[in-house]
């Protein structure tokens, strides 16, 4: 008996060959006997099976002595064996199909997890095996969990369904839903203008939901809410911000906040959720700021740095086109008495620049200028 | 809802060979038959041959010393070649799904055969 | 192969008219038969198919009937939209083919 696997909600050809090249009559039954369908002459006649309006054949193949009955959007429970009787033979088919689900919903929050459940037909012992985007393999039966799910997990998975030596393959699409960066740092001078940008790692149509950017200012003893917010079909629109700081924030996807200026008491970190609609859960991105101050008071030029720096950076000043007078791994370096010209503050990492800040010492009889 | 995106060089000198592939999104690949048709600037409609997901071909007669249709299952694609082209091969192409009667269809490629 | 010939090539038509096109097979096709429109710049578009079956999301003022070798689409009431190339087609054997077409114009 042939074996045939076929996907739920698929279309499956079940084929029948006669020795003679030719249109002559057949007729496919089920394993109770009902008539599915069959010829009378050149047309296609049909019994009263429930496959009914959902099976066919194809004239054109008559002639060539194939005799095909095609069943459209499978389900499970057209498993069974199919019996086509052609110039007295019978010829026997048996159809299994299997279905393929996800959970609850193919659109999970970074660190959910992802169900697969197996329909299969009475009496089947499948085995399934998926592929992750990101090309790790699991193994199953009747249902596949995959626990805290990763960015890298969007995607297609794979999944095949191992049964008589049989495969069929299903394909899922799995979006995780997450921002595109777990945390990020802007590095400001006192005084700039600040950008956060909260880029999503997906896209859907509609996106609704809410969300809040809590800051806590290394000042600070607690922390506060900044800014909540709304989020309807892709539109932002602000709920309520702080007086101190104003924060602006942008119309339009992807989030954007805008702080006016950067000061040291707004130095910190700040954690952005994002719950959305009909999801159990919150999106987050966390986002430090780090803010660099350098003044002249009287003989001592100070160098300043508020915010979460780990503890590998460098802090440094030096005379512009000159080695660094000092240099520390510390958030706040000086110089006394410094020499007139253009000093530079250096915040680095492993010698790259993240922070500079410029400050101009004036002969002793002037003030200074910071440009 | 099934559709079909199809692509492929729309500019030929004559003896040339046209390619053209067709992907299927959102629908069952397995158990239908996938169709070319082509139809000159002005005129009527012209089937040149099918496929199956399992590689089973028939051609139109006119067109068969030509033509080659091929199946890719795992990118739900398949492809049309015709070899030595001539100006009379002008057409808009079509890649089409079927059991008996041709829906959906391809948006269309018109291939131009000009010296 | 099967020739497929449709009458009239040509015909005018006012909004409201009832249309009546014909196609006649070379030999007998049963009920294989499919017609379809096609509008200008646009692909063909499945109307009627086995003859007389009206195709899923088709408005019912058309209509097929026919066996054979004979066979007739029929628009009860001529709409704006319905101005377009009606083409039938014969699924009885290989290779498939097609009738030159009917144009549709408005009077």
């Known amino acids: 008996k042939k074996v045939v696997l076929g996907k739920k909600g698929d279309t499956v050809e079940l084929t029948c060959t006669a020795s003679q090249k030719k249109s002559i009559q057949f007729h496919w039954k089920n394993s109770n006997q009902i008539k599915i369908l069959g010829n009378q002459g050149s047309f296609l006649t049909k019994g009263p099976s429930k496959l009914n309006d959902r099976a066919d054949s194809r004239r054109s193949l008559w002639d060539q002595g194939n005799f095909p009955l095609i069943i459209k959007n499978l389900k499970i429970e057209d498993s069974d064996t199919y019996i086509c009787e052609v110039e007295d033979q019978k010829e026997e088919v048996q159809l299994l199909v299997f279905g393929l689900t996800a959970n609850s919903d193919t659109h999970l929050l970074q660190g959910q997890s992802l169900t697969l459940t197996l329909e299969s037909p009475p009496g089947s012992s499948p085995s399934v095996q998926c592929r992750s985007p990101r090309g790790k393999n699991i193994q199953g039966g009747k249902t596949l969990s995959v626990s805290q799910l990763e960015l890298q997990d969007s995607g297609t998975w794979t999944c095949t369904v191992l049964q008589n030596q049989k495969k069929v393959e299903f394909k899922i699409d799995i979006v995780v839903l997450a921002f595109q960066k777990a945390s990020s740092i802007v590095y400001k001078k006192e005084g700039e203008q600040v950008e956060f940008s909260f880029p999503l790692a997906f896209t859907v149509e509609k996106l609704t939901g809410s969300g809040e950017l809590w800051w806590q200012a290394e000042r600070a003893s607690s922390s506060k809410s900044w800014i909540t917010f709304d989020l309807k079909n892709k539109e932002v629109s602000v709920k309520r911000v702080t007086q101190d700081p104003k924060l602006q924030m942008g119309k339009k996807l992807p989030l954007h906040l805008t702080l006016p200026q950067a000061l040291p008491q707004y130095a910190g970190s700040g954690n952005l959720t994002l719950a959305l609609e009909a999801k159990t859960g919150k999106l987050h991105q966390e986002v430090n700021l780090v803010v660099m101050r350098a003044t002249q008071l009287q003989k001592n030029l100070t160098c300043e740095v508020w915010g979460p720096t780990s503890p590998k950076l460098m802090l440094s000043l030096k005379l512009e086109n000159k080695e660094a007078k000092v240099s520390k791994r510390e958030k706040a370096v000086w110089v006394l008495n410094p020499e007139a010209g253009m000093w530079q503050c250096l915040l680095s990492d492993s010698g790259q620049v993240l922070l500079e800040s410029n400050i101009k010492v004036l002969p002793t009889w002037s003030t200074p200028v910071q440009p | 809802q099934v559709q079909l995106q199809q692509w492929g060089a729309g500019l030929l000198k004559p003896s040339e060979t046209l390619s053209l592939t067709c992907a299927v999104y959102?629908?069952?690949?397995?158990?239908?038959?996938w169709s070319w048709i082509r139809q000159p600037p002005g005129k009527g409609l012209e089937w040149i041959g099918e496929?199956?997901?399992?590689?089973?071909?028939n051609y139109n007669p006119s067109l068969k010393s030509r033509v080659t249709i091929s199946v890719d299952t795992s990118e739900n694609q398949f492809s049309l070649t015709l070899i030595s082209v001539t100006a009379a091969d002008t057409a808009v192409y079509y890649c089409?799904?079927?059991?008996?009667?041709?829906?959906?269809w391809g948006q269309g490629t018109l291939v131009t055969v000009s010296s | 192969d099967i020739q497929m010939t449709q009458s009239p090539s040509s015909v005018s038509a006012s909004v409201g008219d009832r249309v009546t096109i014909t196609c006649r097979a070379s030999?007998?096709?049963?009920?294989?038969l499919a017609w379809y429109q096609q509008k200008p710049g646009k692909a063909p578009k499945l109307l009627i198919f086995?003859?007389?079956s009206l195709q899923s999301g088709v408005p019912s003022r058309f209509s097929g009937s026919g066996s054979g070798t004979d066979f007739t689409l029929t628009i009860s009431s001529l709409q704006p939209d319905d101005f377009a190339t009606y083409y039938c087609?014969?699924?009885?054997?290989?290779?498939?083919?097609f009738g030159q077409g009917t144009n549709l114009g408005i009077k």
């Open positions: 959102g629908g069952s690949f397995s158990g239908y038959y």
């Open positions: 089409v799904r079927l059991i008996n009667w041709f829906d959906p």
């Open positions: 086995a003859a007389s």
């Open positions: 030999q007998d096709i049963s009920n294989w």
């Open positions: 496929i199956n997901h399992s590689g089973s071909t």
């Open positions: 087609q014969q699924a009885n054997s290989f290779p498939y083919t």
